[in-house]
């Protein structure tokens, strides 16, 4: 079958109450098929490719574990599965300040280099 | 050929704490993901954690987070599955198993033989 | 976390015919789902990963199909060897979870 190309699918929003949790959905396709390599999920507010994160964990060659590097505040926890296409994250004890566009990303290393991020990313409205 | 062979059947109080061992063999152990599943008797399997032994990192289901710990020494291919604080609904039938990889598609391909937990007071 | 819900809870068929399992997950899972097989006292043992693939040395009897929140485990000619409880399990989210089982038995 083709390769498949870079794509990342995320809902234009999500809505949920201040002291609640959300979940973020993001998933995603490559071309490096079988890529069972380095990699890193990163999820970032405000902008996309300059952002700051708010979460960052890596999954060494071979493995489905995403070791968390950076969760801030402790509140950012990933749900899907990086290894089947899923970058899902979930959001505890939402805040005010947490209204606000999220964007994540997915990078590749080892023997593949290659990134991607979404543009447009995910709206979490907090009411 | 890959075994996973576990320690075997334990007996505690409740409060107390449990530790269980997998050694792993056949395979080269730090490269692959072990995790740690149970079955209470007569239930089904329940995903309790999971550790990379090549980096030490682990994840945890967070019904048990709060009291579960796994670890790994790779200078003997072995993981271990800590369980404190036990309660009556923690008897049961633990096992590690081995989270194979092929192609690109992960999978729990090698099982140990299962270690029985018993809490009684 | 994901609920697995699978149907019928228990099954007995013929030694010869179709058995067929259902596996519903709470939301889509993708393709991530395989199937195990236990018998008693021992360990789960891979069938089918990834919805649709056999493992190395499972006969070609039990194939697997579905994606998204529907699955089914199928085997086509049961033999008195697949008297076993069955499990799906989803990978796609972390915690993994199985399906609560579903007992095989001849009739």
């Known amino acids: 079958s083709p390769a498949q190309r870079w794509s990342m699918q995320v809902p234009p929003e999500v809505s949920a109450e201040a002291g609640d949790a959300a979940v973020l959905p993001c998933t995603f396709t490559h071309p490096h098929r079988h890529y069972d390599g380095p990699l890193t999920a990163i999820w970032r507010a405000g902008e996309p490719y300059a952002g700051p994160q708010v979460f960052r964990c890596a999954a060494a060659r071979g493995s489905e574990l995403c070791q968390t590097a950076l969760s801030l505040h402790g509140r950012f926890r990933l749900l899907g599965n990086p290894r089947r296409n899923d970058l899902s994250l979930r959001v505890e004890r939402l805040a005010l300040a947490d209204d606000r566009r999220y964007f994540c990303r997915v990078e590749f290393a080892g023997d593949v280099h290659d990134r991607y991020e979404s543009r447009h990313g995910v709206r979490l409205h907090v009411t | 050929q890959v075994q996973l062979v576990q320690s075997g059947a334990e007996v505690k109080k409740p409060g107390a704490s449990v530790k269980v061992s997998c050694k792993a063999s056949?395979?080269?152990?730090?490269?692959?993901?072990v995790s740690w599943v149970r079955q209470a008797p007569g239930q089904g399997l329940e995903w309790m954690g999971v550790?990379?032994?090549?980096?030490?990192?682990?994840g945890y289901n967070e019904k048990f987070k709060a009291r579960v710990t796994i670890t790994a020494d790779t200078s003997t291919s072995t993981a271990y599955m800590e369980l404190s604080s036990l309660r009556s609904e923690d008897t049961a039938v633990y096992y590690c198993?081995?989270?194979?990889?092929?192609?690109?598609?992960?999978?729990?391909?090698?099982w140990g033989q299962g270690t029985l937990v018993t809490v009684s007071s | 976390d994901i609920v697995m819900t699978q149907s019928p809870d228990s099954l007995a068929v013929s030694l010869g015919e179709r058995a067929t399992i259902n596996c519903k997950a709470s939301?889509?899972?993708?393709?991530?789902v395989d199937w195990y097989q236990q018998k008693p006292g021992q360990p789960p043992k891979l069938l089918i990963y990834?919805?649709?693939n056999r493992y190395t040395g499972v006969p070609d009897r039990f194939s697997g199909s579905g994606s998204g929140t529907d699955f089914t485990l199928t085997i086509s000619s049961l033999q008195a060897e697949d008297v076993a409880v069955y499990y799906c399990?989803?990978?796609?989210?972390?915690?993994?979870?199985f399906g609560q089982g579903t007992k095989v038995e001849i009739k």
């Open positions: 198993a081995r989270r194979g990889l092929n192609s690109g598609y992960w999978f729990f391909d090698f």
């Open positions: 056949g395979y080269t152990f730090p490269r692959y993901d």
């Open positions: 550790i990379h032994p090549g980096s030490g990192g682990t």
């Open positions: 939301q889509n899972v993708g393709s991530n």
């Open positions: 990834e919805s649709t």
């Open positions: 399990m989803q990978s796609n989210f972390f915690p993994f979870t």
